[in-house]
């Protein structure tokens, strides 16, 4: 007897982090035997939508015309073949930016830092928030994800980098959010260019050793794992 149907692949274009008001297309790719595709959204009546496959029948398209809070969340898709329904896809977490006003990102003591020294990136919001994310341009994942303990609201989060190496150089933005929805983020802060001068190369920068320099959209899940305590906020990095 044949085993379970292979799970489909689910992804979003142009990515899974979408600004308010922009369109997004969700794709579900199964097999050539697929007769129907179904998309489910967590905490919504199932199915969210059903689509016939597009030729050559191995994928289907689900569309969002203008991103709003209601579309943010976790999605899974399935396909039906002559032998039944597939396993669910891995989840797609669709995140909306623009839900809150943009925070301010600054570098202390300065965005111009000598290799081997320390710098702290400070993300400040006008209204109290409980989650802050620091994003580096062209990194596939958020660098750091700070969440306050016990839902305490804070106006800022500090992202210390020490010792700084050339890897830390680049363009950063930060977002703020409320814990009741991980899928709703603020507008991005204005970009901050961190310039590292000098040639000292420290082998293990911390805590941002996970910084990815791979090119690509910021379309990965925004929920990193692991934590250490930090000034009332929990620090997460990958």
């Amino acid at each position: 007897q044949a085993g379970p149907l292979p799970k489909p692949t689910l992804w979003a274009e142009p990515g899974s982090v979408i600004s308010w008001g922009n369109s997004v297309t969700i794709w579900c790719q199964g097999t050539l035997e697929a007769r129907e595709y179904r998309l489910d959204k967590e905490e919504s009546p199932a199915p969210w939508d059903r689509q016939n496959p597009l030729e050559p029948k191995n994928k289907a398209r689900f569309s969002i015309p203008s991103m709003t809070e209601d579309y943010a969340g976790r999605y899974r898709c399935y396909y039906r073949s002559p032998v039944g329904w597939s396993q669910p896809s891995d989840p797609l977490e669709l995140v909306m930016t623009g839900a809150y006003s943009k925070p301010t990102l600054s570098a202390l003591p300065s965005p111009l830092v000598t290799s081997g020294k320390s710098v702290t990136l400070l993300c400040q919001s006008r209204s109290p928030m409980d989650t802050f994310l620091l994003i580096k341009e062209r990194a596939a994942h958020p660098l750091l994800h700070l969440r306050s303990e016990h839902g305490a609201q804070q106006h800022q989060a500090e992202f210390p980098m020490s010792p700084v190496t050339s890897v830390h150089g680049g363009t950063y933005r930060c977002f703020s959010s409320h814990g009741f929805s991980h899928y709703l983020l603020s507008h991005p802060s204005d970009p901050l260019e961190l310039i590292v001068s000098g040639s000292l190369e420290d082998p293990r920068p911390s805590p941002t050793r996970s910084v990815s320099t791979a090119a690509g959209p910021e379309d990965q899940p925004l929920m990193p794992t692991g934590s250490v305590p930090h000034s009332g906020l929990r620090r997460h990095w990958e």
């Epitope: 008001g21 689900f62 709003t68 579309y71």
Partner: antibody, heavy 121, light 108 residues
Amino acid sequence: EQSVEESGGDLVKPGASLTLTCAASGFSFSSTYCMCWVRQAPGKGLEWIACIHGVSTNNRWYASWPKGRFTISKTSSTTVTLQMTSLTAADTATYFCARSDTDYEWGLSLWGPGTLVTISS
Amino acid sequence: ELVMTQTPASVEAVVGGTVTIKCQASESIGSRLAWYQQKPGQRPKLLIYKASTLASGVPSRFSGSGSGTEFTLTVSDLECADVAAYYCQCAGQSSTWAFGGGTEVVVK
């Protein structure tokens, strides 16, 4: 053949309410469509009123000018309504139902013939 | 609130000539712009979507260009059949499907 057709247009008095219906033929609503209402006063231009997503009834988009007097709803997988309240002479127009389509980057690719609404005492 | 401003309100041209219609969005809408043609007594017809892509069956005499906030519709080799009102529209960007005020094209 895919088509949409409006119904419910009438002559009513100022202050009255009216519900227009848009019936789709040859297709049913899905996430790849929005259904929209557009109106055109005699001798005037097109004026967008509202759109609703084919699957997500929470997602309705309105122009700012009706100020809550108009409500778009999906009543089945092939019908959409526009409820209009506190009507005035300025609401006299031909009301079109149109389909916004992801294949056309959400342009309005399919239009009904329109239904005439006249507000007069 | 996003506003679409269309110019001119009316344009007169000769058969075989060229007409250019401008459309300006009050904020950037990327390429989410559509153009429509409406002949007297008829329903509107989609001409161009995604700022420059011709809808099926539309003659290549029609062309669209632009992105962000500035867009243009050009009708070349004008024919009598092109006498109509033309409208630009933001197609869903920033949660609006707002139209421009329209341009009447008449043939001399």
